[in-house]
Amino acid sequence: AVNGTSQFTCFYNSRANISCVWSQDGALQDTSCQVHAWPDRRRWNQTCELLPVSQASWACNLILGAPDSQKLTTVDIVTLRVLCREGVRWRVMAIQDFKPFENLRLMAPISLQVVHVETHRCNISWEISQASHYFERHLEFEARTLSPGHTWEEAPLLTLKQKQEWICLETLTPDTQYEFQVRVKPLQGEFTTWSPWSQPLAFRTKPAALGKDT
């Protein structure tokens, strides 16, 4: 039997993926569990197998269609259930009526590249992946730069309050190795959260020009 606290959290990537995490204190051991998705106004339903990510936490991805297909809209409500097998029966462990565009977490930005680098400056661009056309320009970004001798957690956050897929980093030190990351968030949605950070982009500033011989 299961008592104790349970948490069931899901996010929509705005296109064709709902990612879910279910955690349960005193959870069923060696049990097969699934997430079932039943939209209120669509003919399809979908299932994914929950796989352990920690002692009492499981995760899975509901793949709703091709990565860039628009499978849900702002009016959809999807009933999500956690079902766990006990003998021959499926037990209903958790239920959530899920409004996809109130629970957004986009994919991490991709294709980071150095457009131009100088001694003290670096211009970097990126692209967003699998983001709905519904957002138009209603997105914001956060970026951070890893300097030598520091950690990512210490890096100050740079906020871009508009859909701007580039940044010009300034006041950099010449001939120095840096790393850069960016993440994205739609402005829409009560429970919307930041995407994961992008893969880090490593770059090196140009050396300072040598002074003339005297």
Partner: nanobody, 122 residues
Framework: QVQLQESGGGSVQAGGSLRLSCAAS????????MTWYRQGPGKEREFVSS???????TYANSVTGRFTISRDNANHTVYLQMNSLSPEDTAMYYC????????????????WGQGTQVTVSS
């Protein structure tokens, strides 16, 4: 056996208010997920609002800001406060209760009420 009893429907002028209630008898110690649906004349049944076993509330876009769902955990009753009603809200309103897993609980079973009629005239 689970019994659902809905009440609170009636006729009201546009702009008026009604409060629906749905009481689930039996298995009072079990965790439940309660949902209101409605079916207007010549329309398909549609989701209105729900309240989870954890208290999380969800509303259809068409009723957000006008309807409020709440529950009395002690006697497994859910309420739907409907304000600023319009003729488009005219429908039969149904309550659905779904039980979650627990010792002696009828999990996996969904129970529907008979419905309560709401009529809004302009």
């Amino acid at each position: 056996q689970v019994q659902l009893q809905e009440s609170g429907g009636g006729s009201v002028q546009a702009g008026g208010s009604l409060r629906l209630s749905c009481a689930a008898s039996g298995y009072e110690y079990c965790r439940i997920h309660m949902t209101w649906y409605r079916q207007g004349p010549g329309k398909e049944r549609e989701f209105v609002s729900s309240i989870g076993s954890d208290g999380r509330k969800t509303y259809a876009n068409s009723v957000t800001g006008r309807f409020t769902i709440s529950r009395d955990n002690a006697n497994h009753t859910v309420y739907l406060q409907m304000n600023s009603l319009s003729p488009e809200d005219t429908a039969m309103y149904y309550c659905k209760t779904e039980y979650l897993y627990g010792l002696g609980c009828p999990d996996g079973s969904a129970y529907w009420g008979q419905g309560t009629q709401v009529t809004v005239s302009s």
